[in-house]
């Protein structure tokens, strides 16, 4: 049966049996800035090109055991959520991965900047169709990271980022606080904001919308056919990156402003229980859960 | 995220160092009255002191970025400090990434073309 998260973002008409736009997102390239990935996983094999870009800090701790499957875990799962054969949102999208997070899931602002610059240079050298950049990471507020995101967005690239898992105001984190970036919070199967222990999804006026981010089934780096459930605002952002890829594939000329409007327009409204958010943040936090456009756009989205 | 609202720095720390003294060896003095600013992560555990992104003014060319980086290295060396240019940015933002002592920040902020300097910091998978 269809995983809850794909059902949640799918127009009602397509919920009958399985989620299945085979070419969804085929005109779009999605860049993933994350950990290394297991590119030969059956879910993403042939769909993800691993670039030679790598800029990561050393792992903490003297006894850290670098196990390939652990190093690849986060990125592999997200690549699967965006474009996986069985459990992906935009099954037609092609992806390129850049390694900016180490085996412990840690990176640097500078490494991320150099990664964004790499994408811009690639875009200039070989212009392709629409580009989506997925940034499933967060650090403290950074003027320079936000500025780089702004420049890339002004070059026509769509940036999607995780709101952050700190149960805090997303405006205190980057790139979540960059106005030009589409910032995504996480909700669960009950349309509740995701709780991650004491922490949970970020919130506030710097969040653009929410998307499924709890118990998301996706590719596991434990083996080439394994699946695993993961949670977080990274998973939520991956859903929106996939939806954006489908929208841009259907309408490649969409501007960032138009894409943002469409994402908001087609979202489910007022389904999130706002009591979870701090009182002063409720009015500032958008009550929107991302979804694909309805079947009136059948010819565009489900070719 | 959330377009159409002004940027909010939150707890973001900003140290503004005014440009006063004439720096030795400066062929091009900064425009009168401009102030380059220093920024660092508000969350201390995520700070990475010793590595800095020097962001130059918007229209700065790559050759000027490289020249500014070399000038910083030369002036630092005269003071007995080793520095290492890790990357020169161009394409998105003009500037460079430098490994150096925090003691050199005041000097770096006085270099021509400098808009602001940000200390490197950690980001995490979410």
């Amino acid at each position: 049966s269809i995983p809850w998260n794909l059902e949640r973002i799918t127009p009602p008409r397509y919920r009958a049996d399985e989620y299945q736009p085979p070419d969804g997102g085929s005109l779009v390239e999605v860049y993933l800035l994350d950990t290394s990935i297991q590119s030969d996983h059956r879910e993403i094999e042939g769909r993800v090109m691993v670039t030679d870009f790598e800029n990561v800090p050393e792992e903490d701790g003297t006894r850290f055991h670098r196990q390939a499957s652990k190093c690849d875990s986060h990125g592999t799962h997200l690549a699967g959520v965006v474009s996986g054969r069985d459990a992906g949102v935009a099954k037609g999208a092609s992806m390129r991965s850049l390694r900016v997070l180490n085996c412990q899931g840690k990176g640097t602002v500078s490494g991320t900047l150099i990664g964004l610059e790499f994408i811009r240079k690639s875009q200039l050298v070989q212009p392709v169709g629409p580009l989506v950049v997925l940034l499933p990471l967060a650090g403290g507020y950074s003027r320079v990271l936000n500025a780089a995101c702004q420049r890339l967005a002004r070059a026509g690239v769509v940036l999607v980022t995780a709101a952050g898992n700190f149960r805090d105001d997303a405006c205190l984190y980057s790139p979540a606080s960059a106005p030009e970036v589409i910032t995504v919070g996480a909700t669960n199967a009950q349309d509740q904001p995701v709780t991650l222990g004491t922490l949970g999804t970020n919130f506030g006026r710097c969040v653009d919308l929410f998307a499924p981010g709890e118990d998301i089934i996706g590719a596991s780096s434990d083996c080439s056919t394994c699946f695993v459930s993961q949670s977080g605002t990274s998973q939520a952002a991956a859903h929106v990156a996939g939806i954006a890829a489908m929208m841009l594939s259907a309408e490649p000329e969409l501007t960032l402003a138009e894409l943002r409007q469409r994402l908001i327009h087609f979202s489910a409204k007022d389904v999130i229980n706002e009591a979870w958010f701090p009182e002063d943040q409720r009015v500032l936090t958008p009550n929107l859960v991302a979804a694909l456009p309805p079947s009136t756009h059948e010819n565009l989205y489900f070719q | 995220g959330a377009m159409g609202q002004e940027d909010e720095d939150g707890d973001y720390e900003e140290l503004v160092l005014a440009l006063r003294s004439e720096e030795d060896g400066l062929a091009e003095a900064p425009e009168h009255g401009t102030t380059a600013t220093f920024h660092r992560c508000a969350k201390d555990p995520w700070r990475l002191p010793g590595t800095y992104v020097v962001v130059l003014k918007e229209e700065t060319h790559l050759s000027q970025s490289e020249r500014t980086a070399r000038r910083l290295q030369a002036q630092a060396a005269r003071r007995g400090y080793l520095t290492k240019i890790l990357h020169v940015f161009h394409g998105l933002l003009p500037g460079f990434l430098v490994k150096m002592s925090g003691d050199l920040l005041e000097l770096a902020l006085k270099l021509p073309h400098v808009d602001y300097i940000e200390e490197d910091s950690s980001v995490f998978a979410q």
Epitope: D60, G61, T62, R63, F64, H65, Q67, K70, S73, C103, Q104, G105, K106, N165, F166, L196, G197, T198, L199, S229, Q230, S231, G232 | D44, P45, R47, F124, A125
Partner: antibody, heavy 122, light 110 residues
């Protein structure tokens, strides 16, 4: 409801071994780092060990290094502490505790078990 | 010997405010997140504050945390008899690669 239940405590002679277990329920165990913390009678809290969510890294207090081993079985939602070469000064209530953050921000501990008592005495 | 120093005890009348200091160094409090824990006799500790000043849900806003340099402070306002307990600060120590707790402070309501 999030629960941590320690077991395996008891009275043991110096130099002998003991294995403590901590059964976790009510949360996604494999997403969280886990700690062991102890408290000697009438004394303060003393951190013992930390294991990351995937078991890829472990940290120990100097006082137990080389004698204690922290491990976990994510398929069984269980945390372990293997204690060898026990000494009288290891006598304490041992708590298992969940790390606050799913990743490695060293935020501290947010959920604690009720503790299990270990007495090392001849 | 703990690397984080707290006063052994503090006391105040009901309704008053108490503050508990926790003094460390740049390798712990100075560059790592501080948490505060409350422990009643014979029970497990409970998290009160994390990330210097954030409260988990269910912790009243009478409890607050702050940090300055290499010291952290827990504040309790509107003191109640139910606040009588031991309080510990805790943080990671980068030099030791271990988590460290403070010496503990007993709060007494007069």
């Amino acid at each position: 409801q999030v629960h941590l239940v320690e077991s395996g405590g008891g009275v043991v002679q110096p130099g002998r071994s003991l294995r403590l277990s901590c059964a976790a329920s009510g949360f996604t165990f494999n997403s969280f780092g886990m700690h062991w913390v102890r408290q000697a009678p009438g004394k303060g809290l003393e951190w013992v060990a930390l294991i990351w969510s995937d078991g890829s890294d472990k940290y120990y207090a100097d006082s137990v290094k080389g004698r204690f081993t922290i491990s976990r079985d994510n398929s069984k939602n269980t945390l372990y502490l293997q204690m060898n070469s026990l000494r009288a000064e290891d006598t304490a209530v041992y708590y298992c505790a969940r790390a606050i953050a799913a990743l490695y921000y060293y935020y501290g501990m947010d959920v604690w078990g009720q503790g299990t008592t270990v007495t090392v005495s001849s | 010997q703990s690397v984080l120093t707290q006063p052994p005890s503090v006391s105040a009348a009901p309704g008053q405010k108490v503050t508990i200091s926790c003094s460390g160094s740049s390798s712990n409090i100075g560059n790592n997140f501080v948490s505060w824990y409350q422990q009643f006799p014979g029970t497990a500790p409970k998290l009160l504050i994390y990330d210097y000043n954030k409260r988990p849900s269910g912790i009243p806003d009478r409890f607050s945390g702050s940090k300055s340099g290499t010291s952290a402070t827990l504040g309790i306002t509107g003191l109640q008899t139910g606040d009588e307990a031991d309080y510990y600060c805790g943080t990671w120590d980068s030099s030791l690669s271990s988590y460290v707790f403070g010496t503990g402070t007993r709060v007494t309501v007069l």
